[in-house]
């Protein structure tokens, strides 16, 4: 079986599919321990499909959003860009490479003061469970001809959080993304790590639920820091504050 | 209405080659995953292969390397492509897919393909 | 792979009665809060049709007499009274893991 695979800890997901979320900062979704391509899903075989066509930022990966690509160009054709570095313009915040947020229409770096915990986990905890959109600027979403009169239960297909009722969020599980539990405290979560290791995961977890976010679980037993399980925790005294 | 119509089955010989099709309507197609099940006569379900929203696609080892599933969106059309077919690969191919849930929740009514000499 | 065995591989009951169906999985198909097992109806010369899916949810259309339930890896597909349209061959099936795989069938038949 996959279970060994499964239970490894993945490092990041390519982007899911059209109108859904994936591994970007502010994501609905952490990557799941997951079948990683290249390296052992043997079910899977993939296409070079680059670039990445997209109609949200969460679809992207760590260091891109999405966006069309030519200034004025065709509003239904979006593609994953690169993330814009400090001190270039931005519209919002998932614009800025991690490390950084969108103020005052410029990528400046996320202090201490602004954002708790590290860096790297900033803009995924610190806007990862809020689902509305950041700077005023409204996101252009792909409609399906499904309209979506209730909120999806657990296990609906979803193309978006904002489809899946309270408490779930839309992730990916096999070919499709289902609306999955937000994460308690204690159940394990995934890192994002930084861009490169291109793994595909075909299974996602949600994001850690109010209050919660993806730590390393404190256990002196563990031999190595890359065996260390990431799990659901509470804040510490960190103070939480969105920025609008 | 959701409809999913199979079409392109036959009588091949083993060895030989058939292109399966499944028009599709009622729904956004290109959103949506689409896989082929099969089942041989007088047997139960197998998967046979899958493709996503985002283009990747699936096989399990039976057919690996000798099927191929794509799509065509603007035609609303799901097509598998069979090579070195074999007596066991003959059955009822369903295209099904997910609109609503997880599972295989819409099928079409199946084509039959026939592998024999 | 994650083997189901269906059990009985046949059930002859009566319009009227309760069929109780039984699926086992050669490992546990609950993962993200979710079990990922679906029961589908089959008639003869038709399609398969989804009745329930995440052990316990009702697909589309499906009338209330039927019913799932189960976690981990036991689960059961409950008739509650059996209508003359309801024979028919049932199949269990998880998506935890790829391959997604089925279960070999229970047919129910009139007794």
């Known amino acids: 079986t996959l279970n060994s695979v499964l239970n490894s800890n993945a490092i990041k997901n390519l982007p899911p599919p059209l109108g859904g979320a994936a591994g970007h900062p502010g994501s609905a979704v952490s990557a799941a321990p997951g079948i990683l391509y290249p390296g052992g899903n043997k079910y899977q075989t993939i296409d070079n499909y680059q670039p990445y066509p997209c109609a949200e930022d969460e679809e992207c990966g760590t260091d891109e959003y999405c966006a069309s690509p030519t200034r004025g160009g065709d509003a239904g054709v979006q593609i994953c860009l690169a993330c814009r570095k400090r001190r270039k313009r931005c519209m919002r915040h998932a614009m800025c490479c991690p490390g950084n947020y969108c103020k005052n229409g410029i990528c400046v770096s996320s202090d201490q003061n602004h954002f708790r915990g590290e860096i790297e986990e900033t803009i995924t905890e610190s806007f990862g469970n809020d689902h509305s959109t950041l700077d005023g600027y409204s996101r252009r979403t792909t409609l399906s001809s499904k309209m979506y009169h209730t909120k999806g239960q657990e296990g609906s297909v979803c193309l978006r959080s904002s489809d899946c009722a309270s408490g779930l969020c839309c992730a990916r599980h096999f070919w499709s993304k289902i609306c999955k539990p937000v994460l308690k405290e204690g159940q394990v979560c995934t890192k994002h790590r930084r861009k490169g290791s291109h793994g595909l995961e075909i299974f996602q977890r949600c994001y850690c639920g109010e209050g919660l976010s993806c730590r390393i679980q404190k256990d002196h037993h563990q031999a190595s820091n890359s065996s260390r399980l990431h799990t659901c925790q509470r804040h510490h005294h960190h103070h939480h504050h969105h920025h609008h | 209405e959701v409809q999913l119509v199979e079409s392109g089955g036959g009588l091949v010989q083993p060895g030989g080659s058939l292109r399966l099709s499944c028009a599709a309507s009622?729904?956004?197609?290109?959103?949506?995953?689409i896989s082929w099940v099969r089942q041989a006569p007088g047997k139960g379900l197998e998967w046979v292969a899958s493709?996503?929203?985002?283009?990747?696609?699936y096989y399990p080892d039976s057919v690996k390397g000798r099927f191929t599933i794509s799509r065509d969106n603007a035609k609303n059309s799901l097509y598998l492509q069979m090579n070195s077919l074999r007596a066991e690969d003959t059955a009822v191919y369903y295209c099904?897919?997910?609109?609503?849930?997880?599972?295989?929740?819409?099928w079409g009514q199946g084509t039959t393909v026939t592998v024999s000499s | 792979e994650i083997v189901l065995t269906q059990s009985p591989a046949t059930l002859s009951l009566s319009p009227g009665e309760r069929a109780t169906l039984s699926c086992r999985a050669s490992?546990?198909?609950?993962?993200?809060?979710?079990?990922?097992m679906n029961w589908y109806q089959q008639k003869p010369g038709q399609a398969p049709r989804l009745l329930i899916y995440?052990?316990?949810k009702q697909g589309s259309g499906i009338p209330a007499r039927f019913s799932g339930s189960g976690s981990g890896t036991d689960f059961t597909l409950t008739i509650s009274s059996l209508e003359p349209e309801d024979f028919a061959v049932y199949y269990c099936?998880?998506?935890?893991?790829?391959?997604?795989?089925f279960g070999g069938g229970t047919k129910v038949e009139i007794k």
């Open positions: 099904a897919t997910s609109l609503e849930n997880y599972a295989f929740d819409y």
């Open positions: 009622g729904f956004t197609f290109s959103s949506y995953a």
């Open positions: 493709v996503s929203g985002w283009l990747d696609t």
């Open positions: 490992e546990s198909v609950d993962d993200f809060g979710i079990s990922f």
């Open positions: 995440a052990a316990s």
């Open positions: 099936q998880q998506s935890k893991e790829v391959p997604p795989t």
